[in-house]
Interface confidence: low
């Protein structure tokens, strides 16, 4: 008779990433007997919640329950019923909620309270909803990609990750771009830090890591665009904003009240002689790039080296995984290949931004116009952030790897968050265990 795999003792975990623009639910699974092994947790499902981020429900909290229903029901289907009660559910809210909390702690608490009550209605082991800090977001993203890349494992890895599979145990830095914030996290060459706020110490699998991390609130791609518009409308002579970051022929009316809704535009706020203005695209990468650079204040630095806005940044070290919107945008623009140099990326962006809006709409007929219209800005912003913000160069550009998934799991903070909260990353190196996933009889 043929050997049959006995049913494994599988465990599951659920993490909801409540981002500024949307919420995603991730389901992870792992063999119970290998909880402390590195690289055994896998993502089995991602469910994108229909609608905006939870911070947008501040005036309609009664709709939050319905908003979360589809994805929570999907989790009910995917996870065996016998496992429901022991499956932990975590919700982490990021920069969208950080911004809401800045405006009103009371409103942010109300949203989280309704989210918690909604999630408590499901048969899972709900562990709470909270706003994670920018530092946590950076750290957990770094843990996620290095866990998935097998960087914490001392033994030979049993899976092959191309092209990231290397024999060295040097960790990857993590570059995360969201809608409202962006994070940079890596192990610098020099172990001492000039800025304790940006320093983290981990002991993982028997090894110490001194990690630099910073989260730039308001510098996610959506908030950066609002900032840019608020900055540029200050000098507009009338209610028409000729914008180089949008394709020629593109037109869109923006309400001034929407522009000043976010705390991110407060520094540019002024009384305008109009309630609305019209963006008219002129599609010029170089001018767009110049406009974006004005968002990064590099005029002062109280440290030996800074990123921007006076934030300490040690010299870049090693390879970096760029994920979330870094990946989504560059993937859309077909610029994620390792072979594409920074000069080539810039050249392609110039070409893309200068294409007429009507042409773009025809070429990408299946893409929602709201998203399609912003790729020129987003691509330019990514280049500006990486090159001028973080000081990557044409040479070090080749050390940036745009990553969507690693071994079927999305790169992002959620896996690292769950690994930490379920105590699945031991401080010490666990005793060697068999590598097989199943027991055979």
């Amino acid at each position: 008779t043929q050997n049959k795999a006995l049913p494994e003792n599988i465990k599951y975990g659920i993490v909801l990433d409540a981002g500024s623009s949307h919420t995603s639910l991730y389901i992870y699974k792992w063999p119970a007997e290998k909880e402390n092994d590195t690289g055994v947790v896998h993502q089995v499902e991602e469910c994108r919640v229909k609608g905006p981020g939870i911070s947008k429900y501040v005036q309609k909290v009664n709709e939050i329950g319905i908003y979360l229903t589809d994805c929570m029901e999907r989790a009910r289907e995917v996870i065996p019923r016998s496992q429901h009660q022991e499956t932990p559910v975590y919700l982490g809210a990021t920069a969208g909620m950080r911004l809401l909390r800045m405006e009103s702690e009371e409103l942010a608490d109300r949203v989280l309270d309704v989210v918690e009550r909604s999630l408590s209605n499901y048969p899972f082991d709900f562990q709470g909803a909270r706003i994670i800090t920018g530092q946590e977001e950076g750290a957990y993203g770094w843990i996620t990609i290095n866990y998935l890349l097998g960087k914490f494992s001392q033994k030979t890895r049993w899976f092959s990750i191309v092209p990231y599979e290397t024999n060295n145990q040097e960790t990857f830095g993590a570059l995360d771009l969201g809608g409202a914030s962006t994070q940079i996290t890596f192990v610098p060459q020099n172990q001492t830090t000039e800025s304790p706020d940006n320093a983290l110490q981990f002991r993982l699998y028997g090894k110490d890591y001194n990690v630099y991390t910073h989260s730039f609130l308001c510098y996610g791609k959506d908030q950066a665009l609002w900032q840019k518009l608020a900055k540029d409308i200050q000098v507009a002579s009338n209610e028409i904003l000729r914008d180089p970051c949008f394709h020629p022929g593109y037109k869109k009316v923006v309400n001034v009240s929407d522009l000043y809704k976010t705390p991110c535009t407060k520094r540019f706020e002024m009384t305008l002689p109009f309630q609305q203005f019209e963006i008219q695209g002129i599609g010029n990468y170089q001018q767009c790039h110049q406009s974006v650079l004005e968002l990064f204040n590099t005029s002062y630095c109280p440290y030996s080296q800074c990123a921007f806005n006076g934030i300490f940044l040690p010299p870049l070290q090693g390879d970096f995984g760029a994920f979330s919107a870094f990946y989504f945008v560059m993937n859309f623009l077909n610029l994620t290949s390792e072979k594409v140099s920074q000069e080539k990326v810039t050249e392609m962006m110039k070409k893309f931004c200068s294409q007429p809006w009507e042409e773009i709409k025809t070429s990408y007929a299946g893409v929602k116009e709201k998203y399609l219209s912003e790729y020129c800005f987003s691509g330019t912003y990514i280049l500006s952030l990486l090159l001028q913000g973080y000081h990557f160069t044409a040479d070090s550009w080749e050390h940036i790897h745009f990553i969507g998934k690693i071994q079927g799991s999305d790169a992002g903070w959620t896996l690292g968050y769950m690994l930490n909260l379920t105590n699945m990353i031991p401080a010490e190196q666990p005793l060697s265990t068999p590598l097989s996933h199943s027991t055979y009889v």
Partner: antibody, heavy 121, light 107 residues
Framework: QVQLVQSGAEVKKPGSSVKVSCKAS????????IGWVRQAPGQGLEWMGG????????NYAQKFQGRVTITADESTSTAYMELSSLRSEDTAVYYC??????????????WGRGTLVTVSS | EIVMTQSPATLSVSPGERATLSCRAS??????LAWYQQKPGQAPRLLIY???TRATGIPARFSGSGSGTEFTLTISSLQSEDFAVYYC?????????FGGGTKVEIK
């Protein structure tokens, strides 16, 4: 005690260039932005531009763009401001100043004594 | 660029009296505003930064207030050494512009 020591007074002909130096003594130099401010006789203060020595990248006020060059030499802890195509209205005292601020606020907390540049034919 | 307007241009005050100097920005500068004192033949000296924080060694009689576009420097009881020109400066947006100055003279 950090001090900013500037070069001596200069008399220049119209159309020529002047290069003023500003040396930091007794403390950190690279980690601070250095700004250049000028003051014409009997007039107010006018910001010209600035540099972060550790990066070597300078920013200039639009009014001086193309005529001013700000540089820094980390090895000697010295910042320089060169102004070209001089005209009589460039006659002024030129100050270098350190931006001692951090993430929240910025301010020129340390000033050089100033360098008088006289442009006269 | 952000235009900084100081008023009055000249303020005549008797020693021991209170002096109130005003500075207005053409657009919001948040609290990124500094005040400097300058005496004839000398370099400016930092008094206040962050709109209201006194710099090291500055006497308590100097105080700053305001945010956004309207700022005030108050000298509670003028001493003889306080008669000078006072400048405000915004450090929010390049170019880092100064106000035209207020001359505080003896009445």
């Amino acid at each position: 005690q950090v001090q900013l020591v500037q070069s001596g007074a200069e008399v220049k002909k119209p159309g020529s260039s002047v290069k003023v130096s500003c040396k930091a003594s007794g403390g950190a130099f690279s980690s601070y932005a250095i700004g250049w401010v000028r003051q014409a006789p009997g007039q107010g203060l006018e910001w010209m531009g600035g540099i972060i020595p550790t990066f070597g990248t300078a920013n200039y006020a639009q009014k001086f763009q193309g005529r001013v060059t700000i540089t820094a030499d980390e090895s000697t802890s010295t910042a320089y401001m060169e102004l070209s195509s001089l005209r009589s209205e460039d006659t002024a005292v030129y100050y270098c100043a350190r931006d001692g601020g951090g993430y929240q606020h910025h301010y020129f907390d340390l000033w050089g004594r100033g360098t008088l540049v006289t442009v006269s034919s | 660029e952000i235009v900084m307007t100081q008023s009055p241009a000249t303020l005549s005050v008797s020693p021991g009296e209170r002096a109130t100097l005003s500075c207005r920005a053409s657009q919001s500068v948040g609290s990124n505003l500094a005040w400097y004192q300058q005496k004839p033949g000398q370099a400016p000296r930092l008094l206040i930064y962050g709109a209201s924080t006194r710099a090291t060694g500055i006497p308590a009689r100097f105080s700053g207030s305001g945010s956004g576009t309207e700022f005030t420097l108050t000298i509670s009881s003028l001493q003889s050494e306080d008669f000078a020109v006072y400048y405000c400066q915004q450090l929010t947006k390049w170019p880092l512009t100064f106000g035209g100055g207020t001359k505080v003279e003896i009445k």
